[in-house]
């Protein structure tokens, strides 16, 4: 069992039972809205305490508190007194016997001055309307199944009434610098919760309610940067609730209180429980955690190794429910693999693997132990094995049909999921560092590509699953395919020569025109060459905006790869052909549903790799080769 699991147990707090004989100043303040001079409250609806204050001191035995249920003889309630500094005396009666506390029938109470034989004050109440519940007695707090989630469960001092109470949770970061103040949330019973103490009569909504979809193990959700008051979603039922939207890796304190529901039972909010503290595990995204399977049986997880620290992976399987059946999951060791350090620029990666099941949600935890022995836990987002299928690297084949005109073909790495496989093809001119990326339609098996003649290129292909059945991260790029486009034929050269002669003549003529007749020259220039927009200025903001939508991610791969390329999609030229859906358009639609997307791991960037910040240079290929993609070959 990892040491992280211990914090689930250590943050459990057992509260001491309240001393019911005394009335605290807190009780008095909680009943401040009760205008009756004789105030009464019940902690469990099986007890009753009544009290009133007298300004003037009176001899012992002056007052008597009498009570009677309908048609019964009045009885006296034994009184105790508390001296009130700067005020006088508080008289308190705790009903001596549970038999004397009856719900749902009017209880007549009156205070009598025995010496004067006068009724000082009187009241009729229903014990079921004067609840002042004691706070939940046992509070357990632990991390939920997603980063930033907190699972809280509690026990009621009086379990038989817990169905008729509503709860409020107050919490905040333990470090006050991180917050503007505590957050208070009413715990609303909903169907997406995890009941910790489910009673037999309450119908479980877990099986019929839609559970939140597990997110993809290779995708990073939006990072929470604001350290101030977190917006959080919360679900509750019975003795349990789940808060989400907290800052992973932070420490929180929390308190609970309860109030009669106002439907079956009435009363006031009770006091807050003593604070419980809990440390949330960090988000494994920070470690660049990526998990995948190649065979739908074994799962491999990898993450960046921290300097001067050791790390260990853990996993557990939970059934396809909103919440794990077991409140305290048993984390199993993920079998460690050899550490890899393929390149100097790449951080060292830790890898581990384990056998998985296809009928369960997979939960991953990474524990990092620093040199002083401090253990930091990082939680991955849960996923199904079929959402983490990594394809083998595809093979790319090409042949040149005519000068600069390439016919490309590739084999589907997985024939069983051909229609769910999407590809990315990237190419770059020799000597250039930046890549142009093309996305064929989903399921395409090839296509044609027009490149500049007499040029050298490198082409690479990668694949990923993005269908209704299977999804997963990108495969690694195929080995670079080197292409040298052919020289044009003689007659093309002749045409080129003619073009050159005519071109030179035109340039000379224009220069003469510009020198002799400048106004005519400007008109002619505008007619022949309308001003073209600066593509980088035009596209720059689009690229920056899109980049903001897809935050950069620490991508983990087998080999030291180039920085992720800029995404530039080139559509088929012919308008009569209806192109098949592209991976990226599919992806943008799916992204909102937390489904994997082909854009998921591709940060958009206008800078080539290794460019210094603020020194973005132009993309050479984008400047030279806006050539059409003739067609994509369908299966």
């Amino acid at each position: 069992m990892p040491s992280w699991a211990l914090f689930m147990v250590t943050s459990c707090l057992l509260l001491a039972p309240q001393n019911l004989a005394q009335v605290s100043s807190q009780d008095v303040s909680l009943l401040a809205s009760d205008s009756e001079p004789l105030k009464c409250f019940s902690r469990t609806f099986e007890d009753l305490t009544c009290f009133w204050d007298e300004e003037e001191a009176a001899p012992s035995g002056t007052y008597q508190l009498l009570y009677a249920y309908p048609r019964e003889k009045p009885r006296a309630c034994p009184l105790s007194s508390q001296s009130m500094p700067h005020f006088g005396t508080r008289y308190v009666c705790q009903f001596p016997d549970q038999e004397e506390v009856r719900l749902f029938f009017p209880l007549h109470l009156w205070v009598k001055n025995v010496f004067l034989n006068q009724t000082r004050t009187q009241r009729v109440l229903f014990v079921d309307s004067v609840g002042l519940p004691a706070p939940p007695s046992i509070i357990k707090a632990m991390g939920g199944s997603q980063p930033g989630e907190l699972q809280i469960s509690w026990e009621e001092p009086a379990p038989e009434i817990s169905d008729f109470l509503r709860y409020e949770l107050r919490y905040g970061p333990r470090d006050p610098k991180n917050s503007t103040g505590p957050t208070v949330i009413q715990l609303i019973a909903t169907e997406t919760c995890c009941p910790a103490l489910q009673r037999p009569h309450s119908a479980s909504a877990l099986d019929q309610s839609p559970c939140a979809q597990p997110t993809m193990p290779w995708q990073d959700g939006p990072k929470q940067t604001s350290p101030s008051r977190e917006a959080s979603a919360l679900t509750a039922e019975g003795g349990s609730c789940l808060i989400s939207g907290l800052q992973p890796g932070n420490s929180y304190w929390l308190q609970l209180r309860s109030e009669p529901d106002g439907i079956s039972l009435g009363g006031s909010w009770g006091s807050w429980s003593l604070p419980v503290t809990v440390d949330l595990p960090g988000d494994a995204v920070a470690l660049g955690l990526q998990c995948f399977t190649l065979d739908l049986k074994n799962v491999t997880c990898q993450w960046q190794q921290q300097d001067h620290a050791s790390s260990q992976g853990f996993f557990y399987h939970s059934r396809a429910r909103c919440c794990p059946r077991d409140r305290y999951p048993i984390w199993e060791n993920c079998e460690e693999e050899e550490k890899t350090n393929p390149g100097l620029q790449t951080p060292q990666f830790s890898r581990c693997h384990f056998k998985s099941r296809n009928d369960s949600i997979i939960h991953i935890l990474v524990e990092v132990t620093t040199a002083p022995g401090t253990v930091h836990s990082y939680l991955g987002s849960p996923f199904w094995i079929h959402q983490a299928v990594r394809l083998p690297t595809p093979n790319l084949h090409w042949r040149e049909i005519s000068s600069g005109h390439l016919e490309l073909e590739w084999q589907h790495p997985s024939s069983w999921a051909a229609q769910e496989t999407c590809y990315q093809l990237r190419y770059t001119g020799e000597g250039h560092q930046d890549w142009k990326v093309l996305e064929p339609p989903l399921g395409a098996r090839g296509g044609t590509l027009e490149l500049r003649p007499r040029s050298r290129y490198r082409l690479q292909l990668r694949a990923r699953l993005n269908g209704p059945t299977y999804q997963g991260p990108w495969s690694s790029w195929s080995d670079p395919t080197r292409v040298e486009t052919a020289t044009e034929t003689a007659w093309i050269s002749l045409v080129t020569a003619l073009h050159l002669v005519l071109g030179l003549s035109a340039v000379l003529g224009l220069l003469l025109l510009r020198w002799q007749f400048p106004a005519h020259y400007r008109r002619l220039r505008h007619a022949l060459w309308p001003s073209l927009p600066d593509l980088h200025r035009v596209l720059g903001q689009y690229l920056r905006d899109t980049a903001a939508l897809s935050p950069p991610k620490a991508t983990v791969s087998d080999t030291c790869e180039e920085v992720e390329p800029s995404l530039l999609e080139i559509l088929p030229k012919s308008s009569e052909r209806t192109p098949l859906p592209l991976c990226s358009s599919q992806a943008q639609m799916d992204y909102r549903r937390l489904q994997p997307s082909c854009l998921g791991t591709m940060p958009l960037s206008v800078c080539p790799p290794m460019a210094e910040s603020g020194s973005c240079c132009t993309t050479h290929i984008a400047n030279h080769s806006y050539l059409p993609l003739s067609y994509w070959q369908q299966p």
């Epitope: 249920y69 009856r102 719900l103 749902f104 009017p106 009729v124 229903f126 079921d128 009569h201 009435g266």
Partner: antibody, heavy 117, light 107 residues
Framework: QVQLVQSGGGLVRPGGSLSLSCAVS????????MHWVRQAPGKGLEWVAG????????YYADSVQGRFTISRDSSKNTLYLQMNSLRAEDTAVYYC??????????WGQGTMVTVSS | DIQMTQSPSTLSASIGDRVTITCRAS??????LAWYQQKPGKAPKLLIY???SLASGAPSRFSGSGSGTDFTLTISSLQPDDFATYYC?????????FGGGTKLEIK
């Protein structure tokens, strides 16, 4: 959802007896007040009897004291009204109802009792 | 026994009218008073409890006020569904007693 389903009732001769039942479902609280209320044809509502569901307290209207008995069976979650020595003025629709600090919030569908020779 | 006197016994009003029904207890009952609505052949339905608290499921156009001995039920804007008989009931002491009822009719 709390439900009160009534049964019994019917035609009975003066001096005769009849038992009414009220099956309670959906209430899980340890104890709660249950009552019988009646309404003579064309008249107003009249409270008849009440009992705490732990059986410790029973209350009756003066008009039925000594003739009617309210009881409950916790194992069956059922409320009863045993009516003896019935009179013509007992003819009414009888309702069972749950009562507490909020009055009678849940009512049965009613059952007709006719006392006639 | 505590007597509950309701007035008027019959009330004619039009849709959209503001309507008030009063109930007086023969002795002080604090705020332990409920109002019910009953339609022919149906069981009564709780509208107001503890003199002024709106019962679950009751429309917000219904409101109650009063304490001690004098109480009122107000319907802010009469709707077609509101034509029925209304009863007040004290539950401060036993025997529990109802008012004689107010029949609300269409004018």
């Amino acid at each position: 959802q709390v439900q009160l389903v009534q049964s019994g009732g019917g035609l009975v001769r003066p001096g005769g007896s009849l038992s009414l039942s009220c099956a309670v479902s959906g209430i899980t609280l340890r104890t709660y007040g249950m009552h019988w209320v009646r309404q003579a044809p064309g008249k107003g509502l009249e409270w008849v009897a009440g009992i705490s569901f732990d059986g410790r307290s029973e209350y009756y209207a003066d008009s039925v004291q000594g003739r009617f008995t309210i009881s409950r069976d916790s194992s069956k979650n059922t409320l009863y009204l045993q009516m003896n020595s019935l009179r013509a003025e007992d003819t009414a629709v009888y309702y069972c109802a749950r009562g507490a600090h909020y009055g009678f919030d849940i009512w049965g569908q009613g059952t007709m009792v006719t006392v006639s020779s | 026994d505590i007597q509950m006197t309701q007035s008027p016994s019959t009330l004619s009003a039009s849709i959209g009218d503001r309507v008030t029904i009063t109930c007086r207890a023969s002795e002080g009952i604090y705020h332990w008073l409920a109002w019910y609505q009953q339609k022919p052949g149906k069981a009564p339905k709780l509208l107001i409890y503890k003199a002024s608290s709106l019962a679950s499921g009751a429309p917000s156009r219904f409101s109650g006020s009063g304490s001690g001995t004098d109480f009122t039920l107000t319907i802010s804007s009469l709707q077609p569904d509101d034509f029925a008989t209304y009863y007040c009931q004290q539950y401060s002491n036993y025997p529990l007693t109802f008012g004689g009822g107010t029949k609300l009719e269409i004018k």
